[in-house]
Interface confidence: low
């Protein structure tokens, strides 16, 4: 509440996050001409990175280009991308929606298609949907442990949301657990009132916002986090602005003395936490 | 404006960015003692990395050191690093400019110079200039969409630069169209005075400053941001205090059993989107 | 000082470190079955990773899970997590604490002891406390660059931490050197009073609070940074809200057409960059 | 199903020692078993827990120097042997048996409980 005697200061913060979570997928597999299911298990080293304090990313769904090398092929034939002739096709041109920069040659993409050639990583990536259920979809149930030093440099007051009473096998919950600061990943969308299964289709944006209203008067100390959250992606965005949440990132090997790469297309939630607040004393 | 009236309130920011763009990179490619002209594709997955979304970074440039292995080698004979006899070299000395250990020997580096030996990764780097003009210079041609969604929790007011009425293959001008949040990396730089292809070959940080001005009264609402641009390194550093915008990763391998790297120092421009500005209410 | 009939200005700020150093890590190494010790050097490509500006990482210890593969084995028998019988076993189960998925089966481990199979990446992590003393503990040695550039855009004015003047062979030192901005990492732990060595074991969070306050009034005009250190994590933490600072990383490859992996979990210290401070004007 | 019974409890004065046992009526031998206990209107707390061949035993704060766990593997009983005790050790002593051979302090890692005990110390 606003105190207009106080000397108000706006908080230093840092965060630190902690994921925690295993996830089974299953996906067909293709390999030398026979598809097969596959099992695998993902751990926090295979799906998420190493970022900084304040914001965190689960990989949630993905699309895999497995053995790409450099050299000239056809491009993708997605919508008005194809060719009959090489008037079509124009030498040194790079598409934006393209993968690589045309030769000036129309070729066959397969039996009954043409696409202008491309020097790029080929095969190209084929502009496929992202899988649906999301191939991580259980990462619902993973939790992240969010731990935060805050500071107000004028006040000299420094603390942190974990307290030595807090129990370290808690879930947060709005009501039962207000304070508790481990966090399951299907509850935060819920409180925001959005469907993990759904965004983890195509990824998104999600805040954790935690608000410190602090009173540093030692007569009405009072100095706890506020938790709520809300999605910051716009889930009505429209197709040309990139919907959801999504990079490509590349893991490069050598076979054969030739430089190769898989090319993994990672859709996924990116939690930003925002943390913000004041301090006021008289 | 300032309205003294107004109970004013900082923004809270959310940023999520994409990099649009391929680049065909011409370099000298030597192998088995050949020196030819090699031609490559650049795209996302190889000049960008996943960041934070308030920063991004596109590599403009690198200098790859190949094949490296740990072992002992004659350090780099740099300015002020060769030696006649053991005597300059100190066992277990790590001098801050060299990539290694000294075990105390001089020894030949090439057929007319010496240099004390080194535990390291071997062998050690060349510090050669960065390449002149920068090897992904194109990279002026790429476009970045910036999306920003912002809140001011005091006024429980959420927002976002992107809007409906929006077309996703706008590109910004400062004056035809300002609202646009798809940027051409050439045209930041144009508008903050600076040259791409001389910034390119060094690397730089670019500052890309959102600034809402937000007025919440419902009689005079107003509430939509303003681009600036700035450089944010400085063009005129001393050589010691590291000019431009570099750093080194390592791609591991194993050939042979032995645990080998490419050791690549990559420069470009590191984009700071920085976000500010003030909510007013009566 | 407070000047209250000064208009103040929060400041906007952008940073950017380098870090500078060589480990030299010796640790047993075990090939065919055979122990021996081995010695690698670490340079900046090997500890330390590209982060945002304001943060950067120094790894200063870690444990490796060398030639991991996606299999069925017996998870690690940690305390609580042996077994006698299938019956303790339970299919599907994902135990937190576990690095896989239970198949319901109670496996040998070793000669002695029996847990329950799982599927995840086999042998499975072992729970073993992080080397004593931290393999690169003489990253205490290290020093970083700090280049901190800001701007009050209500005032229009920018500046640097750097200035033309300084000595790019400088090192911070609260008395002798405080305008410098290259500081040795064990500095930085001794004045926030805290033990380098110590820390290096299961990593921390160590804050670099820069403050400007300016005035910028040109009569009395003043705007020098002022740096001060503190820890920012617990280190009185309680084991279930993972004291320290670790993360864990993977790097992929094949063998014999498998895919396998070496986990590794880093420990280290996040340097947090706190800038903060106002610009004052009449 | 094993059947864990405690017996051996009882009001003792302040200072004072007590054995109590807990006999298993199946093989458990290859079982780590453990002592917990609860005093009025509090959780359940651990107290002590020894490996399925007595080599490991763990000891809360609470009892260490005062309290031993022993087994005899061939009467499948388990003993706590309670000496200097203090008013605030008084509550219903549970004891456990896992199936697993390892030490734990953990209550979800015991498979199998007793009824209790009820120790009193006055002062």
């Known amino acids: 509440s606003d105190k207009l005697y106080q000397r108000k200061e706006p908080v230093i913060s840092s965060v630190h996050t902690k994921v925690k979570g295993i996830a089974e997928v299953t996906e067909n597999v293709t390999e030398g001409g026979v598809t097969k299911l596959g099992h695998s298990i993902f751990d926090t080293a295979d799906y998420t990175f190493p970022l900084q304090g304040n914001s965190f990313f689960v990989m949630t769904n993905y699309v895999k280009s497995e053995g790409q090398v450099q050299t000239l092929c056809p491009e993708y034939p997605r919508r008005g991308a194809q060719c009959s002739s090489d008037r079509r096709c124009k030498k040194g041109w790079m598409d934006p929606q393209s993968k690589g920069i045309q030769t000036g040659r129309c070729v066959p993409y397969d039996k009954t298609r043409k696409t202008c050639e491309v020097s790029a990583w080929c095969p190209t990536e084929e502009e496929k949907e992202a899988p649906r259920p999301a191939l991580l979809r259980s990462a619902e149930n993973f939790t992240v442990l969010i731990k935060n030093n805050i500071h107000f440099p004028g006040h000299n007051y420094t603390t942190r949301n974990i307290l030595p009473t807090m129990n370290g096998s808690c879930t947060f919950h709005k009501t039962w657990d207000p304070q508790c600061s481990i966090f399951r990943l299907g509850d935060i969308f819920q409180e925001a009132g959005e469907n993990f299964t759904e965004v983890a289709v195509q990824g998104g944006i999600m805040g954790i916002e935690i608000y410190w209203d602090c009173n540093l008067d030692s007569w009405s100390h009072h100095c706890r986090p506020r938790y709520s959250f809300r999605r910051l992606d716009d889930k009505n965005m429209d197709e040309s602005f990139v919907p959801g949440y999504n990079f490509r990132y590349a893991k490069y090997y050598k076979e054969n003395n030739v430089e190769k790469r898989t090319l993994i297309k990672a859709f996924g939630i990116r939690f930003d936490i925002l943390v913000f607040g004041t301090g006021g004393k008289f | 404006s300032d309205k003294l009236y107004q109970r004013k309130e900082p923004v809270i920011s959310s940023v999520h960015t994409k990099v649009k763009g391929i680049a065909e990179v011409t370099e000298n490619v030597t192998e088995g003692g050949v020196t030819k002209l090699g031609h490559s594709i650049f795209d996302t997955a190889d000049y960008t990395f996943p960041l934070q979304g308030n920063s991004f970074f596109v590599m403009t440039n690198y200098v790859k050191s190949e094949g490296q292995v740990q072992t002992l080698c004659p350090e780099y004979p740099r300015r002020g690093a060769q030696c006649s006899s053991d005597r300059r070299c100190k066992k277990g000395w790590m001098d801050p400019q060299s990539k290694g250990i000294q075990t105390g020997r001089c020894v030949p580096y090439d057929k007319t110079r010496k240099t004390c030996e080194v535990s390291a990764w071997c062998p050690t780097e060349e510090e050669k200039e960065a390449p002149r003009p920068a090897l992904l210079r194109s990279a002026e041609n790429f476009t970045v969409l910036i999306k920003n969604n912002i809140h001011f929790p005091g006024h429980n007011y959420t927002t976002r630069n992107i809007l409906p009425t929006m077309n996703g293959s706008c590109t910004f001008h400062k004056t035809w169209d300002p609202q646009c949040s798809i940027f051409r990396l050439g045209d930041i730089f144009q508008e903050a005075g600076e040259n791409f292809t001389e910034v390119a070959v060094q690397g730089g940080i670019m500052g890309i400053e959102i600034y809402w001005d937000c007025n919440l009264d419902s009689w005079s609402h107003h509430c939509r941001p303003r681009y600036s641009f700035r450089r944010l390194d400085d063009k005129n550093m001393d050589e010691s205090f590291v000019p431009g915008y570099n750093f080194r990763y390592a791609k591991y391998y194993k050939e042979n059993n032995v645990e080998k790297r490419t050791l690549i120092k990559a420069f470009g421009i590191r984009f700071d989107i920085l976000v500010f500005g003030t909510g007013g209410k009566f | 000082s407070d000047k209250l009939y000064q208009r103040k200005e929060p400041v906007i700020s952008s940073v950017h470190t380098k870090v500078k150093g060589i480990a030299e890590v010796t640790e047993n190494v075990t090939e065919g079955g055979v122990t021996k010790l081995g010695h690698s050097i670490f340079d900046t490509a090997d500890y330390t990773f590209p982060l945002q500006g304001n943060s950067f990482f120094v790894m200063t210890n870690y444990v490796k899970s060398e030639g991991q593969v996606q299999t069925l084995c017996p998870e690690y028998p940690r305390r609580g997590a042996q077994c006698s019988s299938d019956r303790r076993c339970k299919k599907g189960w994902m135990d937190p604490q576990s690095k896989g998925i239970q198949t319901g089966r109670c496996v040998p481990y070793d000669k002695t002891r029996k847990t329950c199979e799982v599927s995840a990446w086999c042998p499975t992590e072992e729970e073993k406390e992080a080397p004593r003393p931290a393999l690169l503990r003489s990253a205490e040695n290290f020093t970083v660059l700090i280049k901190n550039n800001i701007h009050f855009p209500g005032h229009n004015y920018t500046t640097r931490n750097i200035l033309p003047t300084m000595n790019g062979s400088c090192t911070f030192h609260k008395t002798w050197d405080p305008q410098c901005s290259i500081f040795r990492l064990g500095d930085i732990f001794q004045e926030a009073g805290e033990n380098f060595t110590e820390v290096a074991v299961q990593g921390g969070i160590m804050g670099i609070e820069i403050y400007w306050d300016c005035n910028l009034d040109s009569w009395s005009h003043h705007c020098r940074p002022r740096y001060s250190f503190r820890r920012l994590d617990d280190k009185n933490m309680d084991e279930s809200f993972v004291p320290g600072y670790n993360f864990r990383y993977a790097k992929y490859y094949k063998e014999n057409n498998v895919e396998k992996r070496t986990l590794i979990k880093a420990f280290g210290i996040r340097f947090d960059i706190l800038v903060f401070g106002t610009g004052g004007k009449f | 199903e094993v059947q864990l019974v405690e017996s051996g409890g009882g009001l003792v004065q302040a200072g004072g020692s007590l054995r109590v046992s807990c006999a298993a009526s199946?093989?458990?031998?290859?079982?780590?078993m453990g002592w917990f206990r609860q005093a009025p209107g509090k959780e359940r707390e651990f107290v002590s827990t020894?490996?399925?061949?007595?080599?490991?035993?763990v000891y809360a704060d609470s009892v260490k120097g005062r309290f031993t766990i022993s087994r005899d593997n061939a009467k499948d009983t388990v003993y706590l042997q309670m000496n200097s005790l203090k008013p605030e050790d008084t509550a219903v002593y549970y004891c456990?048996?896992?199936?697993?051979?390892?030490?734990?302090?953990?209550?979800?890692?015991?498979?199998?409980w007793g009824q209790g005990t009820q120790v009193t110390v006055s002062s």
């Open positions: 020894i490996s399925w061949n007595g080599a490991d035993t």
């Open positions: 456990a048996g896992s199936i697993t051979s390892y030490v734990s302090t953990w209550q979800h890692d015991y498979e199998y």
């Open positions: 199946a093989r458990t031998g290859s079982y780590s």
